[in-house]
């Protein structure tokens, strides 16, 4: 899915107002020094790309996270601001129907957010203008 | 638990530089923007720039263009600012202040660099 | 460069009165404005972001609201520790620009 046509501003406050409450909670108990953040992106639409497949791609040591509440509401922000965002999705969801996992929480996961977290925060910055 | 400690006060002439530190603790320094501020006696928030520490790329304001210089030692967690050819106008309290967990905010701040310029 | 205005420049009043603090932006910036509190000698702190999302440990008396170009910070009721100075800076672009700043005194 190419994020370019997406409404940044709208899906910006969205994850201020909800998303990033959710991460956090998920991450209580982790050291702030514990990650460095390794996962990068270039601009906002680049971001979107990189934090949609980190929350709903399963990874070794980490299948879990698409079923998180950060997961299923940044699902529902990308589906309500980004123009034909669910019809891409259908496919994708049917297929993570058939590979439900139990919920756990291991150290891998919680890196993986810790960079979402990351990801998250370069997607927000402000443009970075230079004089 | 978070904190920006910054160095102590200058006294400087005109047409000296100062350079202003800021050490970080308490969170991964390389993960997070810092931006400075100063705020002359009696006067308002005048935004300077910001630095990545990780990659060491900076955004000034137009205004210090060409007098700042913000550079960030990984090794020490330490960002400093660098303002040369000092005029009495720059007498201020400067502050550093880490970026925010969500991007969208500067939320813990250093206590602040009080510098005089005088003759 | 976006500039940012603040009003009213100070503004007296008594604890428990209900204040409202106004800033404007002089292009859209949607929703990126915070608001910060400072008291004489202090570093200013964070209290509002994304233009009405409350920062963790701030009461609850004070509140965001506003988007495009008009924000407003308001305390519902003031408490004696609430006299300071409340500046917004926009955050949609950079320079990030302050506002020129509230002193909030008692009447």
């Known amino acids: 899915y190419d994020f370019t046509n997406c409404d940044f501003e709208k899906i910006k406050a969205a994850y201020l107002s909800t998303i990033s409450k959710d991460l956090i909670t998920y991450m209580s108990g982790t050291k702030s020094t514990e990650f460095n953040n390794t996962v990068s992106c270039s601009n906002r639409p680049h971001c979107l790309t990189e934090i949609q497949s980190l929350t709903f791609n399963p990874t070794a040591g980490c299948a879990s996270l698409a079923k998180e509440m950060f997961a299923m509401k940044t699902k529902a922000a990308l589906a309500i601001w980004c123009p034909g965002y669910s019809e891409t999705q259908i496919n994708a969801t049917q297929a993570m129907k058939k590979r439900r996992k139990r919920k756990v929480t291991t150290n891998k996961c919680l890196e993986q957010v810790s960079q979402l977290q990351g990801l998250w925060r370069r997607f927000n910055r402000p443009l970075l203008k230079q004089q | 638990q978070v904190q920006l400690v910054q160095s102590g006060a200058e006294v400087k002439k005109p047409g000296a530089s100062v350079k202003v530190s800021c050490k970080a603790s308490?969170?991964?320094?390389?993960?997070?923007?810092i931006e400075w501020v100063r705020q002359a006696p009696g006067q308002g928030l005048e935004w300077m720039g910001i630095?990545?520490?990780?990659?060491?790329?900076?955004y000034y304001a137009q205004k210090f263009q060409g007098r700042v210089t913000m550079t960030a030692d990984k090794s020490t967690s330490t960002a400093y600012m660098e303002l040369s050819s000092l005029r009495s106008e720059d007498s201020a309290v400067y502050f550093c202040?880490?970026?925010?967990?969500?991007?969208?905010?500067?939320?813990?701040w250093g206590q602040g660099t009080t510098l005089t310029v005088s003759s | 460069d976006i500039q940012m205005t603040q009003s009213p420049s100070s503004l007296s009043a008594s604890v428990g009165d209900r204040v409202t603090i106004t800033c404007r932006a002089s292009e859209n910036i949607y929703s990126n404005l915070v608001w910060y509190q400072q008291k004489p000698g202090k570093a200013p702190q964070l209290l509002i972001y994304?233009?009405?999302n409350l920062q963790s440990g701030v009461p609850s008396r004070f509140s965001g609201s506003g988007s495009g170009t008009q924000f407003t910070l308001t305390i519902s009721s003031l408490q004696p520790e609430d006299f300071a100075t409340y500046y917004c800076q926009h955050f949609y672009e950079t320079p990030l620009t302050f506002g020129t700043g509230t002193k909030l005194e008692i009447k």
């Open positions: 308490g969170y991964a320094f390389t993960n997070y923007l």
């Open positions: 202040a880490k970026e925010s967990l969500t991007g969208s905010s500067y939320d813990y």
């Open positions: 994304g233009a009405r």
């Open positions: 630095i990545n520490p990780e990659s060491g790329d900076t």
